[in-house]
Amino acid sequence: KVILDKYYFLCGQPLHFIPRKQLCDGELDCPLGEDEEHCVKSFPEGPAVAVRLSKDRSTLQVLDSATGNWFSACFDNFTEALAETACRQMGYSSKPTFRAVEIGPDQDLDVVEITENSQELRMRNSSGPCLSGSLVSLHCLACGKSLKTPRVVGVEEASVDSWPWQVSIQYDKQHVCGGSILDPHWVLTAAHCFRKHTDVFNWKVRAGSDKLGSFPSLAVAKIIIIEFNPMYPKDNDIALMKLQFPLTFSGTVRPICLPFFDEELTPATPLWIIGWGFTKQNGGKMSDILLQASVQVIDSTRCNADDAYQGEVTEKMMCAGIPEGGVDTCQGDSGGPLMYQSDQWHVVGIVSWGYGCGGPSTPGVYTKVSAYLNWIYNVWKAEL
């Protein structure tokens, strides 16, 4: 039976075996097409999610779909039920926390009182002034906290205590990519990790350790990528893996926060990268130990220069490295997080591509996660 399962797939009606390599090859080999069912699936960007959180103290903003304008949520009459609705609109199922924060002097959006209508937040029609003088600061999930803060140095061995959201994504027990835990059910990674193998069965996630081979594997229920855009083939390098069973969080298994929608990082902002990838460009071997390194945001104009990526870095990507080169992500680090620390750790980028590893004019290129928040929320909502 083990041999059969490893090399063959059972089609139903009529019952017969097909070679496992025919799974998810794009051709319907079983009469009912079930060989193409448990495969990497694409999901469109979907409609605009009508709530979002700002980097200004994680304050809640609500979209008026009639005008397309965004408004800040006033704390007046804001309830736990409204907080849960807001978080559900973003696809979260966990219990949120919220508090009042003072309206700041730089508040540039109109502030409105919030109500609920058919499980979506709405602005109260006859909204008067915000009497409390406070906005809603909302956290849908406790995230981005680790037991240990890394030291700012070049490249060094990492501890899972510092990066409890880091996972190894493996195909047939071989490490292929990194990834980040976003919540008990979901792991964030890069779409290109699944180009070679699009069947879900053989993919596993390993969490909770900084050593590659030493932790139990978790079954994957679904792998979802964003709809492919032929105009920008390198864009949309983002994937979500839904785990078959929710993770139990601990000191070494925790989620990282998604970035705020307005998380604009200026050049030279310090960031962190981690992974088990190659330590040399053509080193041919994964690192057994998780490695960490500090890098910085590199200006997209510089990154797109003639001696660098010549316009291939789009608005949905970002570059990071160090100006003199030598510190970079490499093969095997793909899908892992590019991280920024404010109050919590945020995954601002996903290791995506680059020419070589560590070259001074060709730094690492990362999927800009803030460009895909809408897609992430729509996937989560569809899977709630």
Partner: antibody, heavy 119, light 107 residues
Framework: EVQLLESGGGLVQHGGSLRLSCAAS????????LHWVRQAPGKGLEWVSS????????YYADSVKGRFTISRDNSKNTLYLQMNSLRAEDTAVYYC????????????WGQGTLVTVSS | DIQMTQSPSSLSASVGDRVTITCRAS??????LAWYQQKPGKAPKLLIY???NKDTGVPSRFSGSGSGTDFTLTISSLQPEDFATYYC?????????FGQGTKVEIK
């Protein structure tokens, strides 16, 4: 087996309209980018239009923009090309093609359908 | 639009010959280049994508190389079934554009 079967070609007057269809079978239709590519008699290949799996992204060659409309019906496994205001230079064999998963290039093609525009 | 120029336009060769076709882009296209083979009265067939990756089922005698603006398709030992027209195509920017084709004929 992946199959793409174009239909709807034929002779049409200058300024007229035609609707090409491409019936697909043997693959997970709704997961793939689809394309129309044409070839004028004795000439080279010309990309005409592309449509992404859920129709979110649609692109046209400048030569057909505003006159041709690509669409797909994932429930019927069919790709369409609505061609209006046809010109003599639109005379060609029109191929429908399935894009590979990445980078979306046409890797399965139909046998083509001939469109002839008479002036 | 990005112009693709193939050379030669046609060539005559014998079975067993090594054949090289070149394709030049009017601007840098990184590795976003594909090669197709087309036989008379038939639809094109994808051979090579992203400059050097062989599509499934393509014989090992076909290889692609190059990046930026200059690309090459090589048939290491020409077989009778290889006599056809070959097209390069860039997918760096829409509109996707093809070269004018290279016809490989029997000498």
């Amino acid at each position: 087996e992946v199959q793409l079967l174009e239909s709807g070609g034929g002779l049409v007057q200058h300024g007229g309209s035609l609707r090409l269809s491409c019936a697909a079978s043997g693959f997970a239709f709704s997961s793939y980018v689809l394309h129309w590519v044409r070839q004028a008699p004795g000439k080279g290949l010309e990309w005409v239009s592309s449509i992404s799996s859920s129709s979110s992204y649609i692109y046209y060659a400048d030569s057909v923009k505003g006159r041709f409309t690509i669409s797909r019906d994932n429930s019927k496994n069919t790709l369409y090309l609505q061609m209006n205001s046809l010109r003599a230079e639109d005379t060609a064999v029109y191929y429908c093609a399935r894009g590979d998963r990445y980078p979306g290039l046409p890797n399965y093609w139909g046998q083509g359908t001939l469109v002839t525009v008479s002036s | 639009d990005i112009q693709m120029t193939q050379s030669p336009s046609s060539l005559s060769a014998s079975v067993g010959d090594r054949v090289t076709i070149t394709c030049r882009a009017s601007q840098g296209i990184s590795s976003w280049l594909a090669w197709y083979q087309q036989k008379p009265g038939k639809a094109p067939k994808l051979l090579i994508y992203q400059a050097s990756n062989k599509d499934t089922g393509v014989p090992s005698r076909f290889s692609g190389s190059g990046s930026g603006t200059d690309f090459t398709l090589t048939i290491s030992s020409l077989q009778p079934e290889d006599f056809a027209t070959y097209y390069c195509q860039q997918s760096y920017r829409i509109p996707w554009t093809f070269g004018q084709g290279t016809k490989v004929e029997i000498k």
